[in-house]
């Protein structure tokens, strides 16, 4: 089948005093082949504090998954989700409150 | 459009200390953003020295941590770069930059300034 | 640290040849690169971020291409103004650190 970008919605929740739980999800791609990772400060955040949803079939055709992270609250600014799919990539922020992100790529 | 303009002294003396100031203009440093100081020795490396974000937290390269400090000035939109104990060897062109936090990539430099440590 | 070794340090060429510059991490950075030109006498210039994404304003004629340890930048067509200095940069972690430099000089 022919290329589907990934939706990509950034949300937050509550995760303990002063913590919050980030959560990027790629949702409706294909192919499968699909990067999604947090950066922090701009660079790589280490793998063992990220946690992972596998690449799981939504049923029509196409794919999604879901990458975590915990971070201290204030600082969402030196946060962003990073999604590469099919040689085009995005970047998306963590809303401020409890409002979500929803985004296109545009490249 | 984010413009940086590096300042201060031309010639240090062995020993003491390199102070210099770059002047952000068209974005406020608090708002956003990582405050950068590279530098490029004569022989054109170059050198990630460090930060300053936006919050005010510092991240600095662990060669350089011991010697290291940088400030701002959040009134005058300024931030500031101290290197004690220079030696010949911070003989470079210093210069400011900025990334954003979708990337450690650095969109846009000062003109730079060179800094000459000779007795 | 990640160590960037780029090569050639030096290369002649003449307009409207194709050259190619190669950039080895001595880690895996994952896409985490981006390049610079950099004119004798002024500042370094942004040309790709993400290993592969041109800078907004960078011609057509440059190209960038690799994956985890090596990765490389293609100018097409050279153009006089094309001539000068070509740095690599890591951003997968910190110390941020560049390549030795590139130097294109006229043939």
């Known amino acids: 089948g022919s290329t589907v970008p990934p939706m990509v919605n950034v949300t937050r929740s509550e995760a303990s005093e002063g913590n919050i739980t980030v959560t990027c999800r790629a949702s409706s791609f294909y192919p499968r082949n699909i990067i999604l990772t947090w950066r922090q400060d701009g660079v790589s955040l280490s793998h063992d504090t990220q946690q992972w949803g596998d690449v799981l079939p939504d049923g029509n055709g196409t794919y999604q998954t879901w990458v975590a992270t915990r971070i201290c609250r204030g600082e969402e600014q030196r946060f962003t989700c990073y999604m590469e799919h099919s040689g085009n990539h995005s970047t998306h922020p963590v809303p401020s409150g409890n409002s979500h992100h929803h985004h296109h790529h545009h490249h | 459009d984010v413009q940086l303009q590096e300042s201060g002294p031309g010639l240090v003396k062995p020993s003491q200390s390199l102070s210099l100031t770059c002047t952000v203009t068209?974005?406020?440093?608090?708002?956003?953003?990582?405050w950068n100081w590279i530098r490029q020795f004569p022989r054109n490396k170059l050198e990630w020295m460090g930060y300053?974000?936006?919050?005010?937290?510092?991240n600095y390269n662990p060669s350089l941590k011991s010697r290291i400090s940088i400030t701002r000035d959040t009134s005058k939109n300024q931030f500031f770069l101290q290197l004690i104990s220079v030696t010949t060897e911070d003989t470079a062109t210093y210069y400011c930059?900025?990334?954003?936090?979708?990337?450690?990539?650095?969109?846009?430099w000062g003109q730079g300034t060179l800094v000459t440590v000779s007795a | 640290d990640i160590q960037m070794t780029q090569s050639p340090a030096s290369l002649s060429a003449s307009v409207g040849e194709t050259v190619t510059i190669t950039c080895r991490a001595s880690?895996?950075?994952?896409?985490?690169l981006a390049w610079y030109q950099q004119k004798q006498g002024k500042s370094p210039q942004l040309l790709v971020y993400n290993a592969i994404m041109l800078a907004d304003g960078v011609p057509s004629r440059f190209s960038a291409s690799g994956s985890g340890t090596q990765y490389s930048l293609k100018i097409n067509s050279l153009q006089p103004e094309d001539f000068g200095s070509y740095y690599c940069?890591?951003?997968?972690?910190?110390?941020?650190?560049f390549g030795a430099g590139t130097k294109v000089e006229i043939k």
């Open positions: 880690g895996n950075i994952h896409n985490y």
């Open positions: 300053i974000n936006y919050s005010g937290t510092t």
């Open positions: 068209g974005y406020s440093i608090t708002s956003d953003y990582a």
């Open positions: 940069q890591h951003f997968w972690s910190f110390p941020l650190t």
């Open positions: 930059s900025y990334y954003r936090y979708d990337g450690a990539w650095f969109p846009y």
